[in-house]
Interface confidence: medium
């Protein structure tokens, strides 16, 4: 006959990017089904995912309810098959997650340049506004709707020609910068929150060069 | 260590113009809004407006954007506030006070205190 | 602009009690409130953000919580160093804006 041994779930980690939250886990099961449970510091315990072969849950719909709140998950081992039996303590066994905040912590997706627009020796290069999947009177929220002015976007720019790159920074979603008559340059984006201590940056978006179909070009 | 320092106290006429400095140091100037909160005798705390260092933009209370101007100086990690016609009851304490992420004050200088009297 | 009302505007309380300081925001501020401690000729010094998230070195006596328009910034067990003025402010909505303050004394 099969074992009820079970054992208990292991790293526990949070993975998140723009609001988009998994919580993973450690080992891949045998015998044994996963239920987690998710709750803030001062709320009350929801089941998600129960009895789950997977090692990941999507937490996200729970976490978006409110980002600026300090989330904690546990994932409790079942055996297979015979969920109401218990560890040797009379519980399941389960395991903590690290405390997990979401608005310190989601990583920053990449970015995407939208548009560039040249008019004369000046460029406007527009960064994509991000969806996210948070809500506020049932429309889901811009990157830029819920960071707000904590969300800077870096640009680096160089002439096609060269590597010597330039930087810009904005807490809009546009960057205004001269450029020289008659140059093609290349762009790249970066979204930064300068004022965390993890997770700061995105990483690089593609890069977009002028020449190609994003741009619009206007000489005056 | 995080450290906002303010220039020292300034007594006023009304109708002039006083200008506070806050020199940062132990973190990234550019990387923290910087905001300035007042403190009459005796009161509660009052918001003013906040600069960005790294643009220059600035957000102010309503209350005040006609008469204060926030600058900063990168090169010096300093950031200034100058508040213009002053009247009596400007007289207060002054600090600066870095913005944390999410919206709190996490660190502050010491307090300049303004005294306007005739 | 957000309302931040404070209660109440005084409160003694004898050393090792529970102080208990309320904030009321005249709308929906989430979870976006700080609090603050003030001692005579000092800068205010941040104890909470989010409601209910301790500052860096803050004793664990000092808790918070309360989302929304009604928030409790807890001491659970009064200190003799625990005396001073406490702030709440909200960080939701520009322009930040504080509450009355509370002053917390020894019975």
């Known amino acids: 006959s099969g074992t009820t041994n079970t054992v208990a779930a292991y790293n526990l980690t949070w993975k998140s990017t723009n609001f988009k939250t998994i919580l993973e886990w450690e080992p891949k099961p045998v015998n044994q089904v996963y239920t987690v449970q998710i709750s803030t510091k001062s709320g009350d315990w929801k089941s998600k995912c129960f009895y789950t072969t997977d090692t990941e849950c999507d937490l996200t719909d729970e976490i978006v309810k409110d980002v600026k709140q300090t989330y904690l998950a546990r994932v409790f081992s079942y055996p297979a098959g015979n969920v109401e039996s218990t560890g040797s303590a009379g519980e399941p066994l389960y395991e903590n997650s690290p405390e997990f905040t979401p608005y310190l912590e989601t990583n920053l997706g990449q970015p995407t340049i939208q548009s560039f627009e040249q008019v004369g020796t000046k460029v406007n290069v527009t960064v994509e506004d991000e969806r996210t999947l948070v809500r506020r009177n049932n429309t889901f929220l811009s990157l830029r709707d819920v960071f707000g002015k904590d969300l800077i976007y870096t640009l680096y720019y160089w002439k096609s020609s060269s590597s010597g790159k330039k930087t810009a920074k904005t807490n809009t979603n546009e960057f205004l910068i001269d450029v020289d008559k008659g140059e093609n340059y290349c762009f790249s984006v970066q979204a930064v929150i300068p004022s965390r201590t993890v997770n700061r940056k995105s990483t690089d978006s593609p890069v977009e060069c002028m020449g190609q179909e994003k741009g619009e070009f206007r000489e005056i | 260590e995080v450290q906002l320092v303010q220039s020292g106290a300034e007594v006023k006429k009304p109708g002039a113009s006083v200008k506070v400095s806050c020199k940062a140091s132990?973190?990234?100037?550019?990387?923290?809004?910087m905001n300035w909160v007042r403190q009459a005798p005796g009161q509660g705390l009052e918001w003013m407006g906040e600069?960005?260092?790294?643009?220059?933009?600035?957000t102010y209370n309503q209350k005040f954007k006609a008469r204060v101007t926030l600058t900063v100086d990168q090169s010096t990690n300093t950031a200034y506030m100058e508040l213009s016609s002053l009247r009596s009851e400007d007289t207060a304490v002054y600090y600066c006070?870095?913005?944390?992420?999410?919206?709190?004050?996490?660190?502050w200088g010491q307090g300049t205190t303004v005294t306007v009297s005739s | 602009d957000i309302v931040m009302t404070q209660s109440p505007d005084s409160l003694a309380v004898s050393l090792g009690e529970r102080a208990t300081i309320n904030c009321k925001a005249s709308?929906?501020?989430?979870?976006?409130i700080a609090w603050y401690q003030q001692k005579p000729g000092q800068p205010p010094k941040l104890l909470i953000y989010?409601?209910?998230n301790r500052y860096t070195g803050v004793p664990d006596r000092f808790s918070g919580s309360g989302s929304g328009t009604d928030f409790t910034l807890t001491i659970s067990s009064l200190q003799a160093e625990d005396v001073a003025v406490y702030y709440c402010?909200?960080?939701?909505?520009?322009?930040?804006?504080f509450g009355g303050g509370t002053k917390v004394e020894i019975k």
């Open positions: 006070a870095r913005r944390e992420l999410g919206g709190p004050f996490g660190y």
């Open positions: 132990g973190y990234s100037f550019t990387g923290y809004y």
């Open positions: 600069i960005n260092p790294s643009t220059g933009g600035s």
């Open positions: 709308q929906s501020v989430s979870n976006g």
């Open positions: 989010f409601a209910s």
């Open positions: 402010q909200q960080d939701y909505s520009s322009p930040w804006t």
